[in-house]
């Protein structure tokens, strides 16, 4: 079998939901010594970056200015060390937002409920769309989808304090082109006294894991890597 390097990690810096005409930044984290990184979009080569010097950095940033529906879709990346290519990264879905109109989000029976009550969110958008999306702020990867002509409902079932937080909805014109976000609706759930402190499900800043952790190699890192390599050889 043809030898390949481990697959890189692809991330969106700050968010994968990019307002139209704004810039998206995608990071591809590969390996120290990689001489070339390639960003692929819907299976075709989109951009190339050659780090300088290659042995000192473990990834690159790809900048996508002027976001629009033509640039929204599935991205992946690969990298090369010498003549050897890596496996392809996982796919990253990049979404363009602020297309067309703004939906209205409401919640039934209301924004203040007690633990165990059944709650339903309603997202309404009068322009032609059939798919609606509900996101909890700070948890934008957990997208709930629902369908309807001008309105969709999102039944939450019996809620707990883990459901507390701000919610927004979008109308979707396709999987990668979303409307403006609705105004947020803050859901307050009382009860479960032992759980009333801020839980990890309620981060104070959104999507904190969406950061590009690219590092420059220091002399110390190089020594540690060399020591590790020597230790591995001794173990063999």
């Amino acid at each position: 079998p043809k030898q390949t390097l481990p697959k890189p990690i692809i991330r969106a810096e700050s968010t994968y939901m990019v307002p139209k005409e704004k810039q998206a930044t995608l990071c591809c984290q590969g390996s120290y010594g990689a001489v070339e990184y390639q960003l692929h979009f819907e299976g075709s080569l989109f951009a190339v970056e050659r780090p300088k010097p290659p042995e000192r950095i473990n990834g690159v940033k790809f900048h996508i200015p002027d976001m629009n529906s033509r640039k929204a879709g599935r991205y992946s990346c690969i990298y090369r060390v010498g003549e050897l290519w890596s496996e392809r990264s996982d796919l990253l879905d990049l979404v363009v937002t602020e297309m067309y109109d703004t939906p209205t989000l409401s919640v039934h029976p209301g924004p203040e409920v007690t633990s165990g009550e059944k709650v339903t969110f309603y997202c309404r958008l009068d322009t032609a769309t059939s798919m609606f999306l509900l996101l909890k702020e700070g948890r934008s990867r957990d997208v709930q989808r629902s369908y309807g002509k001008v309105q969709a409902e999102f039944p939450m079932g019996p809620v707990t304090t883990a459901h507390r937080g701000s919610y927004r909805c979008f109308g979707s014109y396709n999987n990668y082109a979303w409307s403006f976000p609705s105004e947020p609706v803050k859901l307050l759930v009382t009860g479960d006294i032992e759980n009333t402190s801020l839980a990890p499900t309620d981060p104070t800043f959104p999507d904190s894991w969406d950061t590009c952790l690219l590092t420059r190699e220091t002399g110390l890192q190089k020594d540690l890597a060399l020591w590790d390599h020597t230790a591995q050889n001794l173990l063999r």
């Epitope: 300088k52 200015p65 640039k71």
Partner: nanobody, 126 residues
């Protein structure tokens, strides 16, 4: 707003050379990544060559070793030097820009480019 104007097209014999120029208006040229694309009659537009803001280059396999892309930031101009031309190089050649860009990205996909010139025709025939 960026405007791109191509020049240098014309008719040439197989094996001949041409140099295309693309003049950009505006002060953002130094922060732009630039590219050349071409479209032959009845075919889709295809990537030819691209250059980053710091002069890194990338070429389509079909032109590698024959075409050279370069830029002159003082003149707000990007060039495509074409040599060993073949009949299959006959096409309208378009200059394109990604503005603004950061880092050293070289853009290959046409969707990445947000400014385009009107094109210049290159015909290769005996």
């Amino acid at each position: 707003e960026v405007q791109l104007v191509e020049s240098g097209g014309g008719e040439v014999q197989p094996g001949g050379s041409l140099r295309l120029s693309c003049a950009a208006s505006g002060r953002t040229f130094a922060s732009a990544a630039m590219g050349w694309f071409r479209q032959a009659p009845g075919k889709e537009r295809e990537f030819v060559a691209a250059i980053s803001r710091s002069d890194d280059t990338y070429y389509a396999d079909s032109v590698k070793g024959r075409f050279t892309i370069s830029r002159d930031n003082a003149k707000n101009t990007v060039y495509l030097q074409m040599s060993s031309l073949r009949a299959e190089d006959t096409a309208v050649y378009y200059c394109a820009a990604v503005v603004p860009t950061y880092g050293n990205n070289i853009y290959v996909h046409s969707a990445a480019y947000n400014y385009w010139g009107q094109g210049t025709l290159v015909t290769v025939k005996p």
